[in-house]
């Protein structure tokens, strides 16, 4: 799978994580920080 950094317009897309662009799937993906979940790493869990 080809990946690259997200475009600058997606700055802030991932609330608590790193945004990765999955080129072949034509989609952005959030790699969440520890303790966060959700499509955009918006949920905190204990």
């Amino acid at each position: 799978v080809s990946i690259t950094k997200c475009n600058s317009d997606m700055n802030g897309y991932c609330l608590h994580g790193q945004c990765i662009y999955l080129v072949d799937m034509s989609q952005n993906y959030c790699r969440c920080e520890v303790g966060y979940t959700g499509v955009r790493c918006e949920h905190f869990y204990l």
């Epitope: 690259t4 600058s8 317009d9 897309y13 034509s26 989609q27 499509v39 955009r40």
Partner: antibody
């Protein structure tokens, strides 16, 4: 399956406002950005602006600043685009477009006609 | 705002010809360019994103290349069903469409 269903065609008088809705099904708009694009008859595609429904953040093309308002109601999974002070040049098909979780999934378009 | 200058605005070619359309950005868009095909009365159809990644179901005669500010879209062998208007779109910093290229058969 994922869908963006837009409101029906509108006819407005110059100086009036129009509000076009875009209802999402099959996905949560909070996971996406919703863009708005328009196309006047026989003309090219023009990006107007977008909203991040989760953060409630908007970005607008400079030429529309002050005349367009993009909003989102996450409880009904619906985005809106309101354009004020309409003029004949605003006659166009208006599209909502999902981006973020996938690349550019388009609604069916809404024709707005501005005529006296 | 980033400007996208697309050329030519129209072209006429024969079936089987190689067709090339270019888009020049006013600044580096880091390969974040897509190409759309639009036929009369229809919504635009995405053909290519991230410069050269073909969407599922799109024929391999369509291709894209480029980097920095200069990008190219190619139809290797024009077919009658390719008659349409083609648009580039930069999506690095917000969004800007090129002015479009109307492709006709000679």
């Amino acid at each position: 399956q994922d869908q963006l269903v837009q409101s029906g065609a509108e006819v407005k008088k110059p100086g009036a406002s129009v509000k076009v809705s875009c209802k999402a099904s099959g996905f949560n708009i909070k996971d996406t950005y919703i863009q708005w694009v328009r196309q006047a008859p026989g003309q090219g595609l023009e990006w107007m602006g977008r909203i991040d429904p989760l953060r409630r953040q908007t970005k607008y093309r400079e030429k529309f600043e002050g005349r367009v308002t993009i909003t989102a109601d996450t409880s009904t999974n619906t985005a809106y685009m309101e354009l004020s002070s309409l003029r004949s040049e605003d006659t166009a098909v208006y599209y909502c477009v999902r981006s973020g979780t996938s690349f550019d999934f388009w609604g069916q378009g809404t024709l707005v006609t501005v005529s006296s | 705002d980033i400007q996208m200058t697309q050329s030519p605005s129209s072209l006429s070619a024969s079936v089987g010809d190689r067709v090339t359309i270019t888009c020049k950005a006013s600044q580096d868009i880091h390969k974040y360019i897509a190409w759309y095909q639009q036929k009369p009365g229809q919504a635009p159809r995405l053909l290519i994103q991230y410069t050269s990644t073909l969407q599922p179901g799109v024929p391999s005669r369509f291709s894209g290349s480029g980097s920095g500010t200069d990008y190219t879209f190619t139809i290797s062998s024009l077919q009658p069903e390719d008659i349409a208007t083609y648009y580039c779109l930069q999506y690095d910093n917000l969004r800007t469409f090129g002015g479009g290229t109307k492709v006709e058969i000679k």
